[in-house]
Interface confidence: medium
């Protein structure tokens, strides 16, 4: 489930409570979903430790703005060599996961300053069913989230060669893919520079004229003559990818808010969220407009906060 | 097209000496190897060294070759081929070869362009 | 090191006779062998590359076959002008050595 841009949270679907499944059949899913979760969390982690450690001295700080674009002109290059690269650019901005424990609730209001008032009142009394139970509310302690942009280039210049069989040695291997490469009958062209590497059997071919790659690059093979054997080995695109705008993000959360101390209840959790939703979008309780409400009676969820 | 040596002379043994190869009617490619190829009076041909006439220049030589004799190429048209510590034993008309590859059925397709060759005569 | 060893060393035979020299690799050579005829005096002439394929302009008598150690040049309705020294060459790429390159001594052919 998403809520608005700045500070979405996307909860796990559930089953539909109209879904009858049997014991043992659900006992199997849920067993299921938490090796899974155990799985991710400890990945989640892996790589929370890897950024942190990777990127603590690369953090910036850079607002990118949104900005709407319109398609006005096809551009007519001045020269060839504006054609030599086609590169293309993708924002990601990771979703940052968090685990709603037993007993507790994640509830998101759509307006900020009610979400800060419902903290700053911290303890809430709830009455679920014939229970008059007291929760507190928290900020939700998020951990880090990263954004990117993605740089691909696909060269018009180069290509990738591999499955490229050791059975050279290294400069003869350079000269017999040159070689290879060079031929107009197989879709070639001259050679400007072959980067082997023998350990992977792969190269990367670097044409003199545009347009080469491109005619190689129609057949996935090229062929490649060593001592009258035909080896065919294979072409594909040369890419570059960069990474730019590299930033690092962490906070709290302005409009969700973490709900404790239910651990004692052995309800529905759907019941348990309408109760919640019911009492919080009172003014006199605190609350206002609610956007989302989901809580963990059972296993933990895990709830993805977009930025 | 064609190919002609130059440098052939009379050395005294201990010397060195630059042989120079020039193409005409083509210029080097990834399609050739130039060549250096000897042969003494009445006797039969050496191969002596190929250099790769693309990029990468890449260099092969005959083992007793090795470090006393280099092949360098020097323009998209000439080839060298400088000797050191010269001896009789070295006295024979050096050809330039071209070898050309098709590629199509697998290595080795032969000289098929030669000089007229140059005599280099090492005598005291 | 790559040895070609060529046989025999002379040979005569008559005009419009038949001629055949033999040409042994050291190791396998995969029919990355040429064969040139040389006059005195004349550099080589490129006959017979890929141990078959005649070059252009080399007439069909001039016959190459063989592979692996074994490739023979074989010079059939001989004339006057086929007169020369014949040579065998190899060229092969290999994974541990140098680009090996090697001559046969070469074959003199004389026609009576």
């Known amino acids: 489930m998403e809520a608005d841009k700045d500070d979405t949270q996307q909860i796990l679907k559930e089953h539909s409570p109209d879904e009858f499944i049997k014991d043992e059949q659900n006992k199997g899913l849920i067993d299921e979903i938490t090796k899974k979760n155990i799985q991710l969390k400890k990945e989640i982690q892996k790589l929370e430790t890897e950024l942190q450690e990777a990127t603590k001295e690369f953090q910036i700080k850079e607002d990118i703005p949104e900005t709407k674009m319109k398609f006005l002109s096809v551009e007519t290059p001045e020269n060839d060599s504006q054609l030599s690269n086609i590169s293309c650019s993708f924002q990601v901005s990771s979703k940052v996961p968090y685990e709603i424990q037993k007993g507790q609730a994640l509830i998101t209001f759509e307006k900020e300053e009610v979400a800060q008032n419902v903290v700053s009142m911290s303890k809430h009394h709830v009455q679920i069913k014939d229970v008059n139970l007291e929760v507190t509310a928290k900020p939700v302690p998020l951990n880090s989230g990263v954004r990117f942009q993605v740089y691909v280039e696909v060269s018009k210049m180069k290509i990738n060669v591999t499955e490229i069989p050791d059975t050279l040695r290294e400069d003869q291997m350079r000269d017999k893919l040159e070689l290879s490469f060079s031929k107009s009958r197989n879709g070639g062209g001259e050679v400007d520079r072959v980067d082997y590497d023998r350990q992977s059997g792969s190269a990367v071919i670097t044409f003199v004229e545009i347009g080469v790659a491109d005619k190689i690059l129609k057949k996935k093979e090229y062929p490649l003559y060593i001592n009258q054997t035909c080896h065919r080995v294979t072409v594909s695109p040369y890419t570059e990818i960069h990474l730019k705008k590299y930033q690092i993000f962490s906070g709290t959360s302005k409009r969700t808010v973490l709900l404790t101390g239910m651990e004692g209840i052995q309800m529905d959790e759907e019941i348990v969220e309408d109760l919640i939703n019911i009492h919080f979008q009172r003014a006199k309780n605190g609350g206002g407009e609610v956007d989302v409400v989901k809580c963990s009676l059972g296993q933990p969820h895990i709830a993805y906060f977009e930025e | 097209q064609s190919l002609e040596e130059s440098g052939g002379d009379l050395v005294k043994p201990g010397a060195s000496l630059t042989l120079t190869c020039t193409a005409s009617g083509f210029s080097f490619s990834s399609s050739y190897y130039m060549c250096w190829v000897r042969q003494a009076p009445g006797k039969g041909l050496e191969w002596i060294a190929c250099i790769y006439a693309g990029s990468s220049g890449s260099t092969y030589y005959a083992s007793w070759a090795k470090g006393r004799f280099t092949i360098s190429k020097t323009s998209s048209t000439t080839v060298t081929l400088q000797m050191t510590s010269l001896t009789a034993a070295d006295t024979a008309t050096y050809f330039c070869?071209?070898?050309?590859?098709?590629?199509?059925?697998?290595?080795?397709?032969?000289?098929?362009?030669w000089g007229p060759g140059t005599l280099v005569t090492v005598s005291s | 090191a790559l040895v070609m060893t060529q046989t025999p060393s002379s040979v005569s035979a008559a005009v419009g006779g038949t001629v055949t020299i033999n040409c042994q690799a050291s190791q396998n050579i995969y029919t990355n062998l040429a064969w040139y005829q040389q006059k005195p005096g004349q550099p080589p002439k490129l006959l017979i590359y890929?141990?078959?394929n005649l070059e252009s302009g080399v007439p069909s008598r001039f016959k190459g076959s063989g592979s692996g150690t074994e490739y023979t040049l074989t010079i059939s309705d001989l004339e006057c002008d086929d007169a020369a020294t014949y040579y065998c060459?190899?060229?092969?790429?290999?994974?541990?050595?140098?680009?090996?390159?090697?001559f046969g001594g070469g074959t003199e052919v004389v026609v009576k």
């Open positions: 060459q190899s060229r092969l790429y290999s994974r541990i050595a140098d680009r090996a390159n090697a």
């Open positions: 070869a071209r070898e050309y590859s098709y590629d199509d059925y697998g290595d080795f397709w032969g000289f098929n362009l």
């Open positions: 890929g141990a078959s």
